[in-house]
Interface confidence: medium
């Protein structure tokens, strides 16, 4: 039975050019994390392996950076950028676990308002 | 209007301690994420610790056993207590909510200095 439950960062925004973290958490459940997907829509951004560790999609690499933890941080966003990502957790042995974050890019109303950062 | 203000930073010497908060007033409802970030001087601005809603928490390497994060969501309030801080500590604290996104407070400067 899979008993575990997985919280997002949630329904985001974020301005046109500036920087973005989405992390979830996955709790109650003792099963093993074996990989973590990273989607937008249809598309793969990144995994992050138990044994191999992170991949970023080549389409990506330049905009995405891996982490915190096992979150993702989205940089220099556009407002195509918008829409569902999803973090899908594979566990065993339960299973797929997955959490959805809406995020919502704006036009910058001001341009330093931009929030840019790094994760060191 | 969305405000977020940081308070607690100031002078302290190596190996001693602060408590920053951050108030959060404005919202229709309590952030899902709070975060704390830094910016040292002509450095780029540095995320540092996040919280989750539900209590979940990560930490910068550069801080991990040293800085503890948390969150009072019934008054919208997120703290970050530090510990044996160090020189490298220096920096404007700011924080923010949902995944790093506006609004950006005045920030806190904590000088760690003897």
């Known amino acids: 039975m899979m008993t575990g439950t997985i919280e997002t960062t949630g329904n985001i925004s974020a301005e046109k050019g500036g920087s973005i973290i989405l992390q979830c958490h996955l709790s109650s459940t003792t099963a093993q994390v074996t990989q973590v997907n990273w989607e937008q829509q249809d598309q793969l951004l990144a995994i992050c392996n138990a044994d191999l560790g992170w991949h970023i999609s080549p389409s990506f690499k330049d905009r995405v950076a891996p982490g915190p933890g096992l979150g993702l941080t989205l940089q220099s966003l556009t407002v195509n950028d918008t829409g569902e990502y999803f973090c899908i957790y594979h566990t065993y042995p339960d299973g797929t676990y997955t959490g959805r974050i809406f995020l919502e890019v704006l036009e910058s109303s001001v341009a330093e308002h931009g929030a840019r950062f790094q994760i060191p | 209007e969305v405000q977020l203000v940081e308070s607690g930073g100031g002078l302290v010497q190596p190996g001693g301690s602060l408590r920053l908060s951050c108030a959060a007033s404005?919202?229709?409802?309590?952030?899902?994420?709070m975060g704390w970030f830094r910016q040292a001087p002509g450095k780029e601005r540095e995320w540092v610790a996040s919280?989750?809603?539900?209590?979940?928490?990560w930490y910068a390497d550069s801080v991990k056993g040293r800085f503890t994060i948390s969150a009072d969501n019934s008054k919208n309030t997120a703290y970050l207590q530090m510990n044996s801080l160090k020189p490298e500590d220096t920096a404007v604290y700011y924080c923010?909510?949902?995944?790093?996104?506006?609004?950006w407070g005045q920030g806190t400067l904590v000088t760690v200095s003897s």
């Open positions: 923010t909510r949902d995944g790093g996104f506006d609004p």
């Open positions: 404005g919202f229709t409802f309590s952030p899902s994420w």
């Open positions: 919280v989750l809603r539900g209590g979940y928490t």
